[in-house]
């Protein structure tokens, strides 16, 4: 499966868990393997392109999630969601225009 599809599906599920279920732990469990995949690095040209477009924002979002896990401060989680939100919108629009 392509990275943009994995992130699109993963962020949708993370959103459902957080906003619908109020399950922060479940949200992190969905996002952690996706971040781990990014940390392993791109293997194809499409993955390289995805990493260039979204890698920095996703890494920053992961940092805010880690801060939240230590602090419990919802402001840190909001910063993470702000980044995920913008990545998701860009992925959605790009995916929509090419399919």
């Amino acid at each position: 499966i392509l990275w943009h599809e994995m992130w699109h599906e993963g962020l949708e599920e993370a959103s459902r868990l957080y906003f619908g279920e109020r399950n922060v732990k479940g949200m992190f469990e969905v996002l952690e393997p996706l971040h781990a995949m990014m940390e392993r690095g791109p293997q194809t040209l499409k993955e390289t392109s995805f990493n260039q477009a979204y890698g920095r924002d996703l890494m920053e979002a992961q940092e805010w999630c880690r801060k939240y896990m230590k602090s419990g401060n919802v402001k840190d989680l909001t910063q993470a969601w702000d980044l995920y939100y913008h990545v998701f919108r860009r992925i959605s629009k790009h995916h929509h225009h090419h399919h």
Partner: antibody, heavy 123, light 107 residues
Framework: EVQLVESGGGLVQPGGSLRLSCAAS????????IHWVRQAPGKGLEWVAS????????SYADSVKGRFTISADTSKNTAYLQMNSLRAEDTAVYYC????????????????WGQGTLVTVSS | DIQMTQSPSSLSASVGDRVTITCRAS??????VAWYQQKPGKAPKLLIY???SLYSGVPSRFSGSRSGTDFTLTISSLQPEDFATYYC?????????FGQGTKVEIK
């Protein structure tokens, strides 16, 4: 067509109980999220409680915590708000609403609302 | 709790006017803000979700925007059916909170 229909409102004395119902149709109730929002006469909107129909996960406003209980019966496509130890300040129109997300965005909003049911707490 | 401070609390306008209602969150809520319209004796109706996305079936004269923690609902050309009360609401943190409402009245 998506529909939410509340019932169960009425006049109740302080300290009394009431159970509101929210009958849902036109969508997959099992995988939905239902919220109760109230509006005191001449006032604004106040969020009360929420439930995930599938998991049963719930949240409450501090003002009703310990007194109100939200539940859902997926076999009847109905959500409930059990209200105990009612106070005069609970007097309001109570609305149930579906909480949903949309394509292109991760964020959620209440896209369908019932017509509301009036709860009056008075002696 | 996150406070959503709406202004003005009421305004008078004429048909055809451009109307702007603002909502300020007490802390960051990202773009997790919706706007609702409510007419007397009726349930609220969703107009805008995610700060700037127009809900299905809502006329294009309605628009929403975000600047940091400030959110704006704009009606580009007020129509007779738009006289109502408008509420903002944040959904990123519980408890979900609404603004106190803005009543749009006929001048």
């Amino acid at each position: 067509e998506v529909q939410l229909v509340e019932s169960g409102g009425g006049l109740v004395q302080p300290g009394g109980s009431l159970r509101l119902s929210c009958a849902a149709s036109g969508f997959n109730f099992y995988s939905s999220y239902i919220h109760w929002v109230r509006q005191a006469p001449g006032k604004g909107l106040e969020w009360v409680a929420s439930i995930s129909s599938s998991s049963g996960s719930t949240s409450y406003a501090d003002s009703v915590k310990g007194r109100f209980t939200i539940s859902a019966d997926t076999s009847k496509n109905t959500a409930y708000l059990q209200m105990n130890s009612l106070r005069a300040e609970d007097t309001a129109v109570y609305y149930c609403a579906r909480f949903s997300s949309y394509y292109y965005t991760l964020y959620w909003a209440m896209d369908y609302w019932g017509q509301g049911t009036l709860v009056t707490v008075s002696s | 709790d996150i406070q959503m401070t709406q202004s003005p609390s009421s305004l008078s306008a004429s048909v055809g006017d451009r109307v702007t209602i603002t909502c300020r969150a007490s802390q960051s809520v990202s773009s997790a803000v919706a706007w609702y319209q409510q007419k007397p004796g009726k349930a609220p109706k969703l107009l805008i979700y995610s700060a700037s996305s127009l809900y299905s079936g809502v006329p294009s004269r309605f628009s929403g925007s975000r600047s940091g923690t400030d959110f704006t609902l704009t009606i580009s050309s007020l129509q007779p059916e738009d006289f109502a009360t408008y509420y903002c609401q944040q959904s990123i943190h519980y408890p979900l909170t609404f603004g106190q409402g803005t009543k749009v009245e006929i001048k």
